[in-house]
């Protein structure tokens, strides 16, 4: 089928990086300066994405692949091929439509994106909080309360199981 | 054409103060927000401040607060950063910028040419 279709079509055989030109009988000419072809036979470049404003080159264009773009610092990628660049805020805040606003007591963000969570409930699991939670961290799930009893220490290896219904006596 | 021109820069002592302009023309700035960045020689592009359409404020380089200020006058089409106490680490070149809201920037935002700030004695 390869060798049919390039005997139909003379632009299949152009590789990456050139393109078929039908202004010179459909030969290859490689891809003028800020123009790249990822594919073979394409009848023309496209034109190199340019990194500007508060875009950064993270990769220059070839003739066979497009630039590719970051962020400035302070600002991170959003969007598919990083369309946008979203401003950061600091670990402890999210970003809201007014700006960078400290998280809610009881809820925490230990990036510089993204929203603030809920802190973990450890009483769900049935732990108790070992360390307290910050706009910046989640809080700390220790043992349960039953392991901290008095003369208990989270150090000391667990008692034995105890059969179910029966308490010391 | 739409276009964004800076003006207002030029030559200041440390410690003395400048107004830089930002003015649209061929579209209104009512409804966008303008932000200020700025780049110094060899440093990568940073954000100074930015103003929303409704005048909410982002501050996005912390060494500039209490230090410049920035406000719009829609009437004249006009943003304007007030620079005051400033030091010659905001040697830079100053751009103006007009995306939809301060947090979120495209490729398709309108960019001044920059305005030259030196802070020497």
């Known amino acids: 089928f390869e060798r049919t279709r390039s005997l139909q079509d003379p632009c299949s055989n152009c590789p990456a990086g050139t393109f078929c030109d039908n202004n010179r009988n459909q030969i290859c000419s490689p891809c003028p300066p800020n123009s790249f072809s990822s594919a073979g036979g394409q009848r023309t470049c496209d034109i190199c994405r340019q990194c500007k404003g508060v875009f950064r080159t993270r990769k220059e264009c070839s003739s066979t692949s497009n630039a590719e773009c970051d962020c400035t610092p302070g600002f991170h990628c959003l969007g598919a091929g990083c369309s946008m660049c979203e401003q950061d805020c600091k670990q402890g805040q999210e970003l809201t439509k007014k700006g960078c606003k400290d998280c809610c007591f009881g809820t925490f963000n230990d990036q510089k994106r993204g929203i603030c969570r809920p802190w973990t409930n450890c009483s769900l699991d049935g732990k108790s909080v070992l360390v307290n939670g910050t706009k910046e961290r989640d809080v700390v799930c220790g043992p349960s309360p039953a392991d901290l009893s008095p003369g208990a220490s989270s150090v000391t290896p667990p008692a034995p199981a105890r059969e179910p219904g029966h308490s010391p006596q | 054409q739409l276009q964004l021109v800076e003006s207002g820069g030029g030559l200041v002592q440390p410690g003395g103060s400048l107004r830089l302009s930002c003015a649209a023309s061929?579209?209104?700035?009512?409804?966008?927000?303008i932000g200020w960045f700025r780049q110094a020689p060899g440093k990568e592009r940073e954000g100074v401040l930015c103003?929303?359409?409704?005048?909410?404020?982002?501050i996005y380089a912390d060494s500039v607060k209490g230090r410049f200020t920035i406000s719009r006058d829609n009437a004249k089409n006009t943003v304007y950063l007030q620079m005051n106490s400033l030091k010659p680490e905001d040697t830079a070149v100053y751009y103006c910028?007009?995306?939809?809201?301060?947090?979120?920037?495209?490729?398709?935002?309108?960019w001044g040419q920059g305005t030259q700030v030196t802070v020497s004695s």
């Open positions: 061929g579209f209104a700035l009512d409804y966008s927000a």
């Open positions: 103003i929303s359409s409704s005048g909410d404020v982002t």
């Open positions: 910028v007009a995306p939809r809201i301060c947090s979120t920037y495209s490729s398709d935002d309108y």
